[in-house]
Amino acid sequence: GSVKVLHEPSCFSDYISTSVCQWKMDHPTNCSAELRLSYQLDFMGSENHTCVPENREDSVCVCSMPIDDAVEADVYQLDLWAGQQLLWSGSFQPSKHVKPRTPGNLTVHPNISHTWLLMWTNPYPTENHLHSELTYMVNVSNDNDPEDFKVYNVTYMGPTLRLAASTLKSGASYSARVRAWAQTYNSTWSDWSPSTTWLNYYEPWEQHLGLNDIFEAQKIEWHEHHHHHHHH
């Protein structure tokens, strides 16, 4: 039978090294065996390149295309082929379809004044256009209470968030994850980072513990818990 595309390719770029296109066929397809996505930058002398797609699901194909450090003017011509049959043709401008890279290395540290310091890394090198454009969303949730979650928007430059321990339930295990977007590029959100988990220990003031006692308790609890849940 003839090969048909059910949902045409949708593409996003991380605006540094990779563009990813995904599409859905009208029936289960061995993407790598049956299909090829050709792409060519609309620029004098540019060669045609071929991407071999992989299956994401039975009928969903995905292609990851290496690109040079993207600039606003870049436009790619895309052609989806099944052998000699052209299934779809379109163009793609990476700067208009940005999905930032996922923030990395999310960690939680006890900090002064009964706060937790959440830190992560900007996924872009300083010379990249997106490095200074990212804002972040941090999701903090109670591992045992789905109703207990908070969302923080980090719109300042530094990839950090200070969290008052008093805003979280004492003795509860919390997980945090972070994602990024680039407002000036009207990007989509990045994927969520892997979660990091920690045990919140906050003794209310009426317990009459001194600041140092509380901070030491936090540090001890955090270190013990961190060794048990190092890669959650």
Epitope: L41, G45, H49, V71
Partner: antibody, heavy 125, light 112 residues
Framework: EVQLVESGGDLVKPGGSLRLSCVAS????????MTWVRQAPGKGLQWLSL????????YYADAVKGRFTISRDNAKNTLYLQMNSLRAEDTAVYYC??????????????????WGQGTLVTVSS | DIVMTQTPLSLSVSPGETASISCRSS???????????LDWYMQKPGQSPQGLIY???KRASGVSDRFSGSGSGADFTLKISRVEADDAGVYYC?????????FGQGTKLEIK
């Protein structure tokens, strides 16, 4: 050392044909686009044609489109310009030159960074 | 097609002085920030052209730092400081962004 050596220039009658060759050495020929430029006696430079490193993409000036064909043989490190339906106004020195690096997704540009010595084509009856 | 216009068409400069040649294109040659597809070439009588400047301001390998290129968009300038007798020749600008590529008419530099 990078070298480009053109050959094939000759005296030819109007309406005739000629094939110019440009043998390259000293650089990875297949990675670079190549260009032909000509210069009529006492005149300025005129760009004629470009071919990508693989030979998959070609471009032409309007003045020669449909009459001239650019091609390359990467196994022989040789660039060609097939010239048909030649006219008196095609009389010129023809230069080949190394153009942009096309093995990258966006070609890397260094201008026409090396030129051959030129070969003279004279079209006259 | 992009038209390249050079001024002046001829220039006479004394040794040690600075020569300045302008090149204007009918369309912007800026592809992205820092990427202006404008070159400068020099041709001496009876010789092949040689590249001086590419991407608006980058000196080709082996070219003296007396040669400098500047500009963006559609306006570019080649400056030759401390002109020497050996600098005599014809200077061409060329756009390398859009097909068909195109050269300016050339500027003849004469040393007094």
């Amino acid at each position: 050392e990078v070298q480009l050596v053109e050959s094939g220039g000759d005296l030819v009658k109007p309406g005739g044909s000629l094939r110019l060759s440009c043998v390259a050495s000293g650089f990875p020929f297949r990675d670079y686009a190549m260009t032909w430029v000509r210069q009529a006696p006492g005149k300025g430079l005129q760009w004629l044609s470009l071919i990508s490193g693989s030979g998959g993409k070609t471009y032409y000036a309007d003045a020669v489109k449909g009459r001239f064909t650019i091609s390359r043989d990467n196994a022989k490190n040789t660039l060609y310009l097939q010239m048909n339906s030649l006219r008196a106004e095609d009389t010129a020195v023809y230069y080949c030159a190394v153009d942009r690096l096309t093995k990258t997704i966006r070609p890397q540009y260094y201008g026409l960074w090396h030129w051959g010595q030129g070969t003279l084509v004279t079209v006259s009856s | 097609d992009i038209v390249m216009t050079q001024t002046p068409l001829s220039l006479s400069v004394s040794p040690g002085e600075t020569a300045s040649i302008s090149c204007r294109s009918s369309q912007s040659l800026t592809y992205s920030i820092g990427y202006n597809y404008l070159d400068w070439y020099m041709q001496k009588p009876g010789q092949s052209p040689q590249g001086l400047i590419y991407l608006g301001s980058k000196r080709a390998s082996g070219v003296s730092d007396r040669f400098s290129g500047s500009g963006s968009g559609a306006d570019f300038t080649l400056k030759i400081s401390r002109v020497e007798a050996d600098d005599a020749g014809v200077y061409y600008c060329m756009q390398g962004l859009h097909s068909p590529l195109s050269f300016g008419q050339g500027t003849k530099l004469e040393i007094k």
